[in-house]
């Protein structure tokens, strides 16, 4: 049966995808065939074939970026070290270990789901703009995060969430494969408004909040808080 595992990694970091037999295992590298591929597209990530040091079948996206340790393989550790993780690496990887002496029976089959994350930049909230006499517009921008964020606007007076119908979010996938988000909030003009824009990264369990206050139509952008006071289901920023 195929074992299933999950692992998380930050964009740009290195990660180990675990695929190992119990401790104390010993393998002959002239007998074992090891194959890492992506589960959906079956892209070849890396492999080991006895008496064959060339990896000509490895996909160009993984060449020189995905390695197994020969010393580890001798001990039954066929884990994959993946360098410089990119958002495109967020997928399922399948490790298959076959024994030639056992008639190419599968010795080990492990599927590892890699979740990729990147911190969003601290949001920037524009000074309020008045498209009409009875309306105020705020714009919140945050860039280079992963995965796709959630955006919330908060009434800072009581930490309540504003109605999401009042906001219009546009999420872009940028050239690096990371997300940029722009959220526009339209609210009725009031003498004094104290609001905040919250960018939530669910995978990182992280919220980035910037406040903007209007008093006589003067905007503030100096209330930057990571992990704001609890707003409903929002969590403190932790990385696990």
């Amino acid at each position: 049966d195929t074992q299933e595992k999950e692992v998380r990694a930050m964009v740009g970091s290195d990660v180990e995808l675990s695929c190992a037999c119990p401790e104390g295992s010993r393998f002959d590298l002239n007998d074992v065939y090891v194959y890492w591929q992506t589960s959906e597209s079956k892209t070849v990530v890396t492999y080991h074939i006895p008496q064959n040091s060339s990896l000509e079948n490895v996909d160009s996206r993984y060449r020189n970026r995905a390695l197994m340790s020969p010393a580890g393989m001798l001990r039954g550790d066929f884990s994959l070290r993946l360098f410089n993780v990119t958002p495109q690496d967020e997928q399922k990887f399948h490790c298959l270990v076959l024994s030639q002496s056992l008639g190419f029976q599968e010795v080990l089959s492990v599927e590892v789901t890699l979740h990729v994350a990147a911190n969003f930049s601290v949001p920037v909230v524009s000074a309020p703009h008045s498209p009409s006499q009875d309306e105020l517009t705020f714009t919140c921008t945050s860039i280079n995060g992963y995965p796709r964020p959630n955006v919330y606007w908060i009434n800072k007076t009581d930490n309540s969430l504003l109605d999401q119908a009042l906001q219009n979010d546009t999420v872009f996938l940028n050239m690096r494969g990371l997300y940029d988000v722009v959220s526009v909030l339209r609210i009725a003009r009031t003498p004094s408004v104290n609001i905040g824009c919250c960018i939530e990264n669910v995978l990182l369990q992280q919220n980035l909040t910037v406040g903007s206050q209007t008093g006589n139509d003067i905007g503030e952008r100096d209330k930057i808080t990571e992990n704001p006071v609890s707003t409903g289901e929002k969590n403190a920023a932790t990385w696990s």
Epitope: Y33, Y35, K42, T43, N57, H94, F104, E106
Partner: antibody, heavy 118, light 107 residues
Framework: EVQLVQSGGGLVHPGGSLRLSCAGS????????MHWVRQAPGKGLEWVSA???????YYADSVKGRFTISRDNAKNSLYLQMNSLRAEDMAVYYC????????????WGQGTLVTVSS | DIQMTQSPSSLSASVGDRVTITCRAS??????LAWYQQKPEKAPKSLIF???SLQSGVPSRFSGSGSGTDFTLTISSLQPEDFATYYC?????????FGQGTKLEIK
């Protein structure tokens, strides 16, 4: 234990259709390329078609446009849809598994006879 | 397409004999060659892959050699159960192709 069990052979008239099936067990079916090889009565082995683990398909010129290979990984099954059958397609058809990365046929089905006759 | 030519097409030998079957590819296939044994009314069985690697469970009297275009299958001491038809096959590129077979019969 790796096993490939075939079904679906039989008698068909020229121009007719038939669908062969091959059920795999004892291995992670979705991670292997699978092939069909045939053998006409008293003749040698002839490669027919292949489907890669990722779904890419390959055909011998003699069957291109008439045969379609497919797989259902959820059912651990391989199929060969044969249309516009001709007398020269009459053969025992074998499904075969290909060793990961290596490329040769390490396990074969038991074979199923396709008879094309009017 | 790569043509595979086997010789001889048939061969009579006795138990205990040493037998060699050759296979020639019409173009270089590195070591991407396999040998199969087939008995009447049975599916082929893999013997050798990568030109010289013995498949699991295959007796050591079977051996393969060669690379590029010329390959051989050798049975060092024929046993009664070895009388069958033998095929070579290239898996260097599609379409995969087989030799025409060598039928090994009892003398």
């Amino acid at each position: 234990e790796v096993q490939l069990v075939q079904s679906g052979g039989g008698l068909v008239h020229p121009g007719g259709s038939l669908r062969l099936s091959c059920a795999g067990s004892g291995f992670t079916f979705s991670s292997y390329a699978m092939h069909w090889v045939r053998q006409a009565p008293g003749k040698g082995l002839e490669w027919v078609s292949a489907i890669g683990a990722g779904g890419g398909t390959y055909y011998a010129d003699s069957v291109k446009g008439r045969f379609t290979i497919s797989r259902d990984n959820a059912k651990n099954s391989l199929y060969l849809q044969m249309n516009s059958l001709r007398a020269e397609d009459m053969a025992v058809y074998y499904c075969a598994r290909v060793v990961v990365v290596v490329g040769f046929f390490d396990y074969w089905g038991q074979g199923t006879l396709v008879t094309v006759s009017s | 397409d790569i043509q595979m030519t086997q010789s001889p097409s048939s061969l009579s030998a006795s138990v205990g004999d040493r037998v060699t079957i050759t296979c020639r590819a019409s173009q270089g296939i590195s070591s991407w060659l396999a040998w199969y044994q087939q008995k009447p009314e049975k599916a082929p069985k893999s013997l050798i892959f990568a030109a010289s690697s013995l498949q699991s469970g295959v007796p050591s009297r079977f051996s393969g050699s060669g690379s590029g275009t010329d390959f051989t299958l050798t049975i060092s001491s024929l046993q009664p159960e070895d009388f069958a038809t033998y095929y070579c096959q290239q898996y260097n590129s599609y379409p995969y192709t087989f030799g025409q077979g060598t039928k090994l019969e009892i003398k």
